[in-house]
Interface confidence: low
């Protein structure tokens, strides 16, 4: 079976690295410099990625994988394959239209990305906030008063962080 | 009221120095990217540099080894330091507020600095 | 280098009239609407017009607008007024953090 698609279509043998070369009768020529091709039969190859400016080569391209960017400092990757960067704020900051701007009081973000998120309500599970939240860090929920009694957990540990969003472009 | 204010401008020889600074009042200068342009007279607006919120700074390439920009967020203050000044140098420059995503928003009045022998 | 060339580089205009300027970039600004535009007046500092290709600044009065993708851009003011008589500038960013401004179009009276 192979043999006769090979036969059929000759590209399909040749392997990730190589493209098939219509212009020398269809043989297997290896991907020029700065492209790659990632797949076998391919009949070209793509362009390498170039990670220019505010992109910085996080991984190079090899002749079967294209190269891999993310962001120099003051910037963060926004889309899939770091396909944006976006600029940093402060922690305590968002970015909005008018530039970074402090979390409003009951919000917080730990990034120097991302938006303001709000406290988490300790009361919603039946704690007491034991350190107080702020522009930069979330609240941290300490027992309810009911659970202060002799022998109990003294500090609950805080709930994982949520995953923040992207602002808003 | 919400301004910016060049200074440090003036009348110098080629081959020194000067630092132009950029007084911000009104709102947090550490909230803003900083950017400077300039303009010769008679000619258009040329894109200087700019000093992001982390102190990060990127520049023109015709400026680039000799300019540099920084910012002092506790004095509200965004500086230009401008070495081996030449003849062309000569211009009005100009510090604006804002960042890349969303253009610069606000700027101040501008401060002649003129380079000659 | 980059080249942002902006056209015309005059325009005679009067009060009333639909007054439309482009903007043509050597290669794309940054995510294809990284421009603004600009006003700026004799002996002033420029103003804030458009950003991000369309949108609009604050404060600035809606017959301005701006469109366009890529590499060309267009500010439009839609009924000159008096006060709009200045010269204009677009902006582009690039990959590489620069910032380019256009040569700039100056609108006139006619």
């Known amino acids: 079976f192979e043999r006769t698609r090979s036969l059929q279509d000759p590209c399909s043998n040749c392997p990730a690295g190589t493209f098939c070369d219509n212009n020398r009768n269809q043989i297997c020529s290896p991907c020029p410099p700065n492209s790659f091709s990632s797949a076998g039969g391919q009949r070209t190859c793509d362009i390498c990625r170039q990670c220019k400016g505010v992109f910085r080569t996080r991984k190079e391209c090899s002749s079967t994988s294209n190269a891999e960017c993310d962001c120099t400092p003051g910037f963060h990757c926004l889309g899939a394959g770091c396909s944006m960067c976006e600029q940093d704020c402060k922690q305590g900051q968002e970015l909005t239209k008018k530039g970074c701007k402090d979390c409003c009081f009951g919000t917080f973000n730990d990034q120097k990305r991302g938006i303001c998120r709000p406290w988490t309500n300790c009361s919603l599970d039946g704690k007491s906030v034991l350190v107080n939240g702020t522009k930069e860090r979330d609240v941290v929920c300490g027992p309810s008063p009911a659970d202060l009694s002799p022998g109990a957990s003294s500090v609950t540990p805080p709930a994982p962080a949520r995953e923040p969003g992207h602002s808003p472009q | 009221e919400v301004q910016l204010v060049e200074s440090g401008g003036g009348l110098v020889q080629p081959g020194p120095s000067l630092r132009l600074s950029c007084t911000a009042s009104g709102f947090s200068l550490s909230h803003y990217w900083m950017t400077w342009v300039r303009q010769a007279p008679g000619k258009g607006l040329e894109y200087i540099g700019f000093?992001?919120?982390?102190?990060?700074?990127s520049y023109a390439s015709s400026v680039k080894g000799r300019f540099t920009i920084s910012r002092d967020d506790s004095k509200s203050i965004a500086y230009l330091q401008m070495n081996s000044l030449k003849t062309e140098d000569t211009a009005v420059y100009y510090c604006?507020?804002?960042?890349?995503?969303?253009?610069?928003?606000?700027w101040g009045q501008g401060t002649l600095v003129t380079v000659s022998s | 280098d980059i080249q942002m060339t902006q056209s015309p580089s005059t325009l005679s205009a009067s009060v009333g009239d639909r007054v439309t300027i482009t903007c043509q970039s050597s290669?794309?600004?940054?995510?294809?609407?990284?421009l603004s535009w600009y006003q700026q007046k004799p002996g002033k500092a420029p103003k804030l017009l458009i950003y991000?290709?369309?949108d609009l600044a604050s404060g600035v009065p809606s017959r301005f607008s701006g469109s366009g993708s890529g590499t060309e851009f267009t500010l439009t003011i839609s009924s000159l007024q008096p006060d709009d008589f200045a010269t204009y500038y677009c902006a582009g960013v690039y990959s590489d953090n620069t910032y380019v401004f256009g040569g700039g179009t100056k609108v006139e009276i006619k």
């Open positions: 290669q794309s600004v940054y995510s294809n609407s990284f």
């Open positions: 991000s290709a369309s």
């Open positions: 000093i992001n919120v982390g102190g990060d700074t």
């Open positions: 604006g507020r804002g960042g890349l995503t969303f253009g610069w928003d606000l």
